[in-house]
């Protein structure tokens, strides 16, 4: 048993059918030696009496809000919370798995620069009873500041049957400098409480592997002189990292008809600019991508031909 | 006719070439070492310059001394003035810095040499490092350093296990990857000034 | 007294459908997640299928995937497995278990998938 | 196929020691704890071990189980007539758990 805040502690325990569970001393904080009892959530049943209280925990219905009392007066409360290893793994109920970039991916981290500045996001299909906790920092053994806001849920979706639930956190690392050189990851540890089950989620990572920049902006079409070309140009996003010839983009331009069946013409180039041919009713999209680390593609940024 | 490219432009399309090398070789480490670990998530950082050169330093960006985050690093430094800076280029920061980045790749070298040499020593080939890269590393050297003299440094004795010799070659490899990136953004920014 | 009693095999042609039933008992049969596993005869364990307890995800190998859909009744403290497009490979004993450090299997139902 | 790899079989008199090894990789036994069955012919697996070393009340001290890195090992120390069965390692992959993963089993001869 551990203390996750003040009067609200995890009771870790092996989930099998018939497990034995943990036997728990509950202590009220009183100076009272007397005339106390016990009751659990809105019960009034009285559980024990005495300045502790043993139980031994091994299901849902053991957890809750334990509460001594003296003469009808309330002296103190222990909230208890279940944190179930299931065949040695800690349960993974509350979250979604993304399954992108790969399994078991239930936090997911962006980055539109090198700023130390990162998002991450996660989903679940609970709407109620649900808290979040965010920590971060860089490396562990020997952990640099990250600062991390509040979770707040960011967007809902239907999905078949279900809704779904994604919440996000804005994280920033206390002196970062944009030139480093990343050796120890950025650690992100979520704790989530839904009733009565807590559990936790980690994410490692260094901020240059999940750079997405922002699409690219002012996309703008120049055609040319008796020519079907045009001169497609852009600039580097607001949000990238400057200066930009030390923190260069790459581009990748693509020219897509009306029908996705179409085949897609694609150039890719360090400039910002280039001349393609702009079919009738075809659109021209850029995108943008870190000029020397292989991290994730930009959203397109998008114009039509006509 | 030939086009003649100039020192800075040509350093450029030589660290980009470098990149591409250093790219290639990660890629085969992590596929054929597998076994061992060799993934970035997985190995110890550990960067073999440190202390020794004082690349991130002196290759700052101007508009980056501000932040006082990116000046917390060390001293050292080393000059040699390669045909990677134009002549009317030739301040004190930008000799530094190329300098320093000659002392990185020397390092890097050396130490390949010497994990080739242990590799080629095992009798199971499961890995050598590619010629490219070390031909590419080879290059901006020279580039950096052309009119000083080649230093080829005898690479220390090679380690006879060859589990540990994998292990070095997948944490340096990574390292130096990363170091890459860092000299590539340098050129491109030196090559912009 | 924990107990699990799997139901439902027999013979069956190929093609054809088969819906086996696992009947637990002794315990809090919603709070866990259970697993199919079979065994061909004469060959090892072979994990199939396994569904969360409040039956929110299920998650099968390559082998039975869009085949074999497994669920649950807590109600009725029932696990299931529909097993449909029957193949002669599918032709094992199979096995309910509780998912947990300390599991309990049933005794399993022969499943014979023959012409 | 199963990608945890066991001995196909290992033999021994009574009395003897046998050790049944489980080898598998990083994503499986290195990063999930390991569980051992024993089957004897016509009935349900039973575990032995569980957590890699830990074994249910009411099996005998007798069976004995470890893990160093990537492989697990089962040993039957005072080898009995009954032990003779066939036996399987189970872990998980840290991509597809929960998914079990078994070993392809081995089959224990009590000789003479």
């Known amino acids: 048993i551990w203390e996750l805040k003040k009067d609200v502690y995890v009771v870790e325990l092996d989930w099998y059918p018939d497990a034995p569970g943990e036997m728990v001393v509950l202590t009220c904080d009183t100076p009272e030696e007397d005339g106390i009892t016990w009751t659990l959530d809105q019960s009034s049943e009285v559980l024990g009496s005495g300045k502790t209280l043993t139980i031994q925990v091994k299901e849902f219905g053991d957890a809750g809000q334990y509460t001594c009392h003296k003469g009808g007066e309330v002296l103190s409360h222990s909230l208890l919370l279940l944190h179930k290893k299931e065949d040695g793994i800690w349960s993974t109920d509350i979250l979604k798995d993304q399954k992108e970039p790969k399994n078991k991916t239930f936090l997911r981290c962006e980055a539109k620069n090198y700023s130390g500045r990162f998002t991450c996001w996660w989903l679940t299909t609970i709407s109620t009873d649900l808290t979040f906790s965010v920590k971060s920092s860089r490396g562990s053994s020997d952990p640099q500041g990250v600062t991390c806001g509040a979770a707040t849920l960011s967007a809902e979706r239907v999905r078949g049957d279900n809704k779904e639930y994604e919440y996000s956190v804005e994280c920033q690392e206390d002196s970062a400098c944009p030139a480093a050189e990343e050796s120890l990851p950025i650690e992100v540890m979520v704790d989530a409480v839904h009733k009565l089950k807590y559990e936790n989620y980690t994410s490692s990572f260094f901020i240059r592997d999940i750079i997405k920049p922002d699409p690219p902006k002012n996309l703008q079409l120049k055609p040319l002189k008796n020519s079907r070309q045009v001169e497609v140009s852009w600039e580097y996003p607001d949000t990238w990292s400057t200066p930009h010839s030390y923190f260069s983009l790459t581009f990748c331009v693509q020219v897509q008809g009306k029908s996705k069946r179409e085949k897609k013409d694609r150039v890719f180039t360090d400039k910002t600019s280039a001349t393609v041919i702009c079919r009738k009713n075809a659109s021209i999209s850029v995108r943008a991508q870190d000029r020397y680390y292989s991290s994730s593609w930009s959203e397109w940024a998008s114009v039509p031909c006509s | 006719r030939v086009i003649p490219v100039s020192g800075p432009a040509r350093c450029l399309s030589q660290s980009r070439n470098l990149l591409k090398t250093t790219d290639d070789m990660v890629k085969t480490a992590r596929e054929k070492l597998k076994h061992y670990s060799c993934t970035a998530e997985d190995i110890d950082h550990e960067d073999i310059t440190r202390d020794q050169t004082s690349t991130l330093k002196t290759c700052l960006p101007l508009e980056l001394h501000k932040n006082e985050s990116c000046l917390a690093t060390r001293e050292t430094s080393s000059t040699t003035r390669g045909s990677c800076l134009p002549p009317q280029k030739t301040s004190l920061m930008m000799t530094l810095c190329l300098g320093s980045i000659y002392e990185d790749l020397k390092m890097y070298q050396t130490e390949f040499q010497a994990i080739n040499a242990a590799l080629q020593n095992h009798n199971h080939q499961q890995i050598i490092l590619d010629k490219g890269m070390l031909v590419a590393i080879d290059e901006l050297m020279q580039s950096l350093n052309h009119n000083g003299e080649t230093l080829r440094q005898k690479p220390p004795v090679g380690e006879a296990d060859p589990y540990r010799v994998k292990m070095k070659l997948c944490i340096l490899l990574h390292a130096f990857s990363t170091r890459v990136v860092t000299i590539n953004r340098v050129m491109g920014y030196l090559s912009s000034a | 007294q924990v107990q699990l009693v799997e139901s439902g095999g027999g013979v069956v042609q190929p093609g054809r459908s088969l819906r086996l039933s696992c009947a637990a008992s002794g315990f809090t049969f919603s709070s866990y997640g259970m697993h199919w596993v079979r065994q061909a005869p004469g060959k090892g364990l072979e994990w199939v299928a396994f569904i969360r307890y409040d039956g929110s995800n299920k998650y099968y190998a390559d082998s039975v995937k869009g085949r074999f859909t497994i669920s649950r009744d807590n109600s009725k403290n029932t696990l299931y497995l529909q097993m449909n497009s029957l193949r002669a490979e599918d032709t094992a004993v199979y096995y309910c278990k509780t998912h947990g450090s300390h599991d309990n299997w049933g005794q399993g139902t022969m499943v014979t998938v023959s012409s | 196929q199963s990608v945890l790899t066991q001995p196909p079989s290992v033999s021994g008199a009574p009395g003897q020691r046998v050790t049944i090894s489980c080898s598998g990789s990083?994503?499986?036994?290195?990063?999930?704890?390991v569980k051992w069955y024993q089957q004897l012919p016509g009935t349900a697996p039973k575990l032995l071990i569980y957590?890699?070393?830990q074994r249910p009340s009411g099996v005998p001290d007798r069976f004995s189980g470890s893990k160093s890195g990537t492989s697990a090992s089962l040993a039957i120390t005072g080898l009995q007539a009954e032990d003779e069965a066939d036996y399987y390692c189970q872990s998980y992959d840290r991509y597809t758990h929960p998914a079990l993963l078994f070993g392809t089993g081995t089959k224990v001869t009590v000789l003479g």
């Open positions: 990083r994503s499986n036994i290195g990063s999930n704890t």
């Open positions: 957590y890699n070393d």
